[in-house]
Interface confidence: low
């Protein structure tokens, strides 16, 4: 028996359902009583789901997995993972044994989009050219870790005096806070771009400092 899976990682958004595709080619006369199917975490060998002795043995992994029972006899051994969490990320191995045995691994990459950044300025009044200001760009609830880029009004990257921190909440999602310290020119626009490297999603925020008032 030959097991086939997607070579590309499966990308799943947090709280959505994901299908980890796995298939085999059944011989003529194949019956489910002959099938032993096991899904497990590749690295730790933890059992996720199994089908043995002619029946679905159910989920061994937080009760959020399911097979496609009507499609098994056609060679579809795919696994449905419901309400995906950050902790589900990783490699899953599909083992199929009929008379002989084969296995293959498929990777699950979890992702969550970042919110539109909010911009704050300190100090936020009585600003004059030559003043040092601190601009903070905050974006929330994304995954995996963000890449943060700063640019001035002409699109020139600002790399000096940038400090970025990312904190995970109890669900494993990241809040990113990036701080730019800059000396004010006469007029200036400062833009922050928060990029999700998996989704290739960019979230933009900017602040324009003129004489007054401030524009966000």
């Amino acid at each position: 028996v030959e097991v086939q899976v997607s070579e590309d990682p499966v990308v799943a958004l947090v709280d959505t359902d994901a299908t980890l595709r796995c298939s085999f080619s059944p011989e003529p006369g194949f019956s489910l009583a002959q099938l032993n199917l096991i899904w497990q975490l590749t690295d730790t060998k933890q059992l996720v789901h199994s089908f043995t002795e002619g029946r679905d043995q159910g989920s061994a992994y937080s009760n959020r997995t399911a097979l496609f029972p009507d499609l098994l006899v056609q060679g579809n051994a795919s696994l449905r993972l419901q309400r995906v969490r950050v902790t589900d990320e990783g490699s899953y191995t599909c083992f199929v044994s009929i008379q002989d045995f084969d296995s293959a691994a498929v990777s699950l990459q979890v992702a969550a989009p970042y919110s539109k950044p909010s911009m704050t300025l300190e100090p936020n009044k009585d600003l004059r050219p030559g003043n040092m200001v601190t601009i903070t760009c905050s974006s929330y609830q994304g995954y995996p870790e963000a890449e943060v880029f700063w640019k001035d009004g002409q699109g020139v990257p600002l790399t000096g005096n940038v400090t970025t921190s990312q904190m995970a909440n109890e669900r494993g999602l990241f809040d990113v806070h990036s701080v730019l310290r800059v000396v004010l020119g006469a007029n200036g626009t400062y833009s922050c771009l928060v990029r999700n490297p998996v989704l290739q999603q960019d979230a933009h925020g900017s602040v324009t400092i003129t004489g007054q008032p401030l524009t966000f």
Partner: antibody, heavy 120, light 108 residues
Framework: DVQLVESGGGVVRPGESLTLSCAAS????????VSWVRQAPGEGLEWVSG???????YYADSVKGRFTISRDDSNNTLYLQMNSLRAEDTAVYYC??????????????WGLGTLVTVSS | EVVLTQSPGTLTLSPGERATLSCRAS??????LAWYQQKPGQAPRLLIY???TRATGIPARFSGSGSGTEFTLTINSLQSEDFAVYYC??????????FGGGTKVEIK
């Protein structure tokens, strides 16, 4: 088989620099997070720095601004550039792999470590 | 940062006895806790992660329990190869990732 092999340790004077390397095999270094963890003689473990699969870098406060973590994907190698070394940086430095793309996790594989001694 | 406090500092036991090691977090880390074993001159070795899950190849005599701020590593029927230093590590609130100070399990 997953393997991590550190090198580059040695004896340096306070204020000097050193670069540690960690050659990884058995996995692709940009598909996992990898960290540096150190252990001073007779002491416990201290996380120093980590880099996620997507290249985001983090540092312990004790080394921020002095140490730089980086990697060379083509050579599957992790680096730790250590500047302005102090006596308290003396330790065995371990390279450790997280079992996920993001580094905020436990470490399932460790190297054997390389000893850095900072002494005048 | 989350501070992990391990107790006791040293545990002196005979082979065949049960070892109970404690790790206390300064604030809740849910179940994001791992345990490592380290022998002299060797790198740490992962034993337990997510508080209760044994790593690949770890014998069933090692078990973990707890949640929130109180965690326990239990080694049933100590074998000669189990005498080592044990560290807990949290990965819930970071940076930084933090380790406990260690518990040495030594032969009586």
């Amino acid at each position: 088989d997953v393997q991590l092999v550190e090198s580059g340790g040695g004896v340096v004077r306070p204020g000097e620099s050193l670069t540690l390397s960690c050659a990884a095999s058995g996995f692709t270094i940009n598909s996992y997070a990898v960290s540096w963890v150190r252990q001073a003689p007779g002491e416990g473990l201290e996380w120093v720095s980590g880099i996620s699969g997507s290249g985001v870098r983090y540092y312990a406060d004790s080394v921020k601004g002095r140490f730089t973590i980086s990697r060379d994907d083509s050579n599957n190698t992790l680096y730790l550039q250590m500047n302005s070394l102090r006596a308290e940086d003396t330790a065995v430095y371990y390279c450790a792999r997280s079992n996920k793309v993001t580094w905020n996790n436990f470490f399932d594989y460790w190297g054997l470590g390389t000893l850095v001694t900072v002494s005048s | 940062e989350v501070v992990l406090t391990q107790s006791p500092g040293t545990l002196t036991l005979s082979p065949g006895e049960r070892a109970t090691l404690s790790c206390r977090a300064s604030r809740s880390i849910l179940t994001s806790l791992a345990w490592y074993q380290q022998k002299p001159g060797q790198a740490p070795r992962l034993l337990i992660y997510n508080t209760v899950t044994r790593a690949t190849g770890i014998p069933a005599r090692f078990s973990g329990s707890g949640s929130g701020t109180e965690f326990t590593l239990t080694i049933n029927s100590l074998q000669s190869e189990d005498f080592a230093v044990y560290y807990c590590q949290q990965y819930y609130d970071w940076p930084p990732l933090t380790f406990g100070g260690g518990t040495k399990v030594e032969i009586k």
